[in-house]
């Protein structure tokens, strides 16, 4: 049913080089290598990319040339396995090189590290950045692709090319300004924030694909596309979902050239078939390729058809419900998901999938009974609690965010999640709480009908990262329980967790709460992380501390930092007032 060309090519690498063009080809190969071998330097990867590109050009010139008929996995895998000192640098990943394709590629994929021990990607000073950008824009952008890809091994490759293009445009504009710093900082911060969200969203898609297969991803795509394109018919939505599934499967599987090529093909198809898809695509379709595909991926929802019948007519009142379900289960459930989703752009995809799952379970049970209509007749009413739960979550959390602001809201979440899973490492809890807390800024300011999909689908993506990090070193039964279930049930599972009663509180260690004057010169973000680390440790020491007790301690702590950082002799202030603070904390929590 898909839109993609299927003709065979004598040389796959020549075909992709021709389709993508040299610039995108090189960028994608660099991303692929950086995502597979995350410790290698830019120069090492750049050398390999140049060799692969030179080889691709020989195949373009003559598709029958030696090795041009080999698969991309074979060609890329052979390149990676030829790297000197592979075992010394990558340990057991080197064992992948003893395998044949496709097992070798599977092995490389299994060794991708979601949390590589790399230093944070630091942004150079504006002047320095502009100098190196002007000297060699290609190398500068290559470094950007390499640094992002190695830290985010599942980043959606064609979308990373888009962010690199954004980066390039910002630098071109700002490096010509007198005040480069004030031009660059807000713009690059904006790109960074969007890219980080893109990364966790894509990781969630790959998790869905890896853990639950293509069918689960396709269901996600049907719901999402139906919300965005409510005037497209089911056949059109199914075709788009099938193609989107293929694109994502390729990217998640490391087939980045195919993924980018197929994504471009899908964008082309959508723009050529706007009449049957959506009235909102034209603005996107006027843009060049990378911007077009990005724009289509977040295009506004089309206006819902005015004359849609009530959902009950087809899925509850129709006398042939069980006959339809028995005859073509997947298509019938897919139609239900389509019809429900196109009527509810105000629901999260996770919620829509939970409703479809509930509907399926109801039909499984009821269609086996003597009087099915009497049994499934109340199914839509049974959806109500499933809908109310996330609506209440949004209201409660957005109210709290509006009251506390982002930093205070992050702290509230940090306390909550440390109580739910105190065994989880403090850095992981702080990272998770900071990310979860950003949902307020990102979603709570949106119009009412956009809040729920924004909040829940973002939280689900962040919690997916929590699960991935926890999988590496499982320490909490609570987390294991929530992460073992289906993807769509994770967020409700985490929300329902309460204080872990099995946890033995941590001993109070004074050094955990001992601070030095160097904290005063840290950027605000780093200061916050230090304070949040202390907060998590306090909760681990006293999991049942009241909100009031914790507030008292944190206010005291903030006052202490403020006083000592303003003192003439900071070091003396920290060394004398620090122990007093620790004593007051212990007393307040006693």
């Amino acid at each position: 049913r898909g839109v993609f060309r299927r003709e065979a090519h004598k040389s796959e690498i020549a075909h992709r080089y021709n389709d993508l063009g040299e610039q995108h080809f090189k960028g994608l190969v660099l991303i692929a290598f950086s995502q597979y071998l995350q410790k290698c330097s830019y120069d090492e990867h750049a050398k390999l990319v140049q060799e692969v590109t030179d080889f691709a050009k020989t195949c373009v010139a003559d598709e029958s040339a030696a090795n041009c008929d080999k698969s991309l996995h074979t060609l890329f895998g052979d390149k990676l396995c030829a790297i000197p000192n592979l075992r010394e640098n990558y340990g057991e990943l080197a064992d992948c090189c003893t395998k044949q394709e496709p097992e070798r590629n599977e092995c490389f994929l299994q060794h991708k590290d979601d949390n590589p021990s790399l230093p944070p990607f630091e942004r150079p000073e504006a002047e320095a950045m502009c100098t190196s950008f002007k000297e060699n824009p290609t190398t500068f952008m290559g470094h950007y692709l390499h640094e992002v890809a190695r830290r985010h091994p599942y980043f959606y490759a064609p979308e990373l090319l888009y962010y690199a293009e954004q980066y390039n445009e910002i630098l071109t504009q700002c490096c010509a300004e007198a005040d480069k710093e004030s031009c660059l900082t807000p713009k690059l911060d904006g790109v960074k924030e969007k890219a980080l969200v893109s990364s966790v969203r894509q990781r969630m898609k790959c998790s869905s694909m890896q853990k639950f297969g293509e069918r689960a991803f396709k269901a996600w795509a049907v719901a999402r596309l139906s919300q965005t394109f409510p005037n497209a018919d089911f056949a059109e939505i199914t075709k788009l979902a099938t193609d989107l599934t293929k694109v994502n499967k390729e990217c998640c599987h490391g087939d980045l050239l195919e993924c980018a090529d197929d994504r471009a093909e899908l964008a082309k198809y959508m723009c050529e078939n706007q009449a049957t898809i959506s009235s909102k695509l034209q603005t996107c379709c006027d843009k060049p390729l990378l911007k077009k595909a990005h724009c289509l991926s977040e295009v506004e929802h089309d206006t819902m058809p005015a004359d849609l019948p009530a959902i009950a007519a087809d899925f509850v009142e129709d006398q042939e419900v069980c006959k339809n379900y028995a005859e073509a289960k997947d298509v019938f459930l897919g139609t239900f998901l389509y019809e429900y989703s196109r009527r509810h752009p105000d629901y999260s995809v996770s919620l829509l999938l939970r409703l479809a799952k509930k509907y399926e379970a109801t039909l499984e049970k009821c269609c086996a009974e003597a009087n099915p209509p009497a049994c499934y007749g109340t199914v839509l009413a049974e959806f109500q609690p499933l809908v109310e739960e996330p609506k209440n979550l949004v209201k409660t959390n957005c109210d709290l965010y509006e009251k506390l602001g982002e930093y205070g809201f992050q702290n509230a979440i940090l306390v909550r999640y440390t109580q739910k899973a105190p065994q989880v490492s403090t850095p992981t809890l702080v990272e998770a709480a900071r990310n979860l807390g950003r949902v307020g800024t990102k979603c709570c300011t949106l119009p009412e009908d956009q809040r729920l999909p924004c909040v829940e689908d973002y939280l689900s993506a962040i919690l997916n990262r929590v699960c991935l990090l926890h999988e590496k070193t499982p320490v909490s039964e609570h987390v294991t329980k929530c992460c073992s279930g289906s993807l769509v049930e994770r967020r409700p599972c985490f929300s329902a967790l309460t204080v872990d009663e099995t946890y033995v509180p941590k001993e109070f260690k004074a050094e955990t709460f001992t601070f030095h004057s160097d904290i005063c010169t840290l950027p605000e973000k780093e200061k916050q992380i230090k304070k949040q680390t202390a907060l998590a440790e306090l909760v681990k020491h006293k999991p049942k501390a009241t909100a009031e007790q914790l507030k008292t301690v944190m206010d005291d702590f903030a006052q202490f930092l403020d006083t000592c950082c303003k003192a003439a002799d900071k070091d003396t202030c920290f060394s004398t007032e620090g122990p007093n603070l620790v004593t007051r904390c212990k007393d307040a929590l006693a």
């Epitope: 018919d233 056949a235 059109e236 899925f315 019809e339």
Partner: nanobody, 123 residues
């Protein structure tokens, strides 16, 4: 209101093929399930094939499954019935019908009907 006009019926040899068309006008075509029914002399009108609302699913009676194919073109507001390996017992007046139900088979669920087109299969 939906108006339906069938065409393409004629006399054909057993084993031959035929394609019937049904052009719709009036309301939004994709909002309707489209069905083909047939009525042989002295018999009840029977369901042959359906294309679910919103082009969601194609379904057939057991007697034509594997031989007939229903398809639709929403841009042209037309539904087709491709009939292969025709048999003398396929002789009937073929009617096109439209319904707001999802995947209807029962003739009573179809609110709009065409005038019919005659298909005769000779042995």
């Amino acid at each position: 209101q939906v108006q339906l006009v069938e065409s393409g019926g004629k006399l054909v040899q057993a084993g031959g093929s035929l394609r019937l068309s049904c052009a719709a006008s009036g309301r939004t075509f994709s909002n309707y399930a489209m069905g083909w029914f047939r009525q042989a002399p002295g018999k009840e009108r029977e369901f042959v094939a359906g294309s679910g609302r919103s082009n969601s699913y194609n379904y057939y009676s057991d007697s034509v499954k594997g031989r007939f194919t229903i398809s639709r073109d929403n841009a042209k507001n037309t539904v087709y019935l491709q009939m292969n390996s025709l048999k003398p017992e396929d002789t009937a007046v073929y009617y096109c019908a439209a319904s707001t139900n999802l995947w209807p088979r029962d003739r009573n669920l179809y609110a709009y009907w065409g005038q019919g087109t005659q298909v005769t299969v000779s042995s």
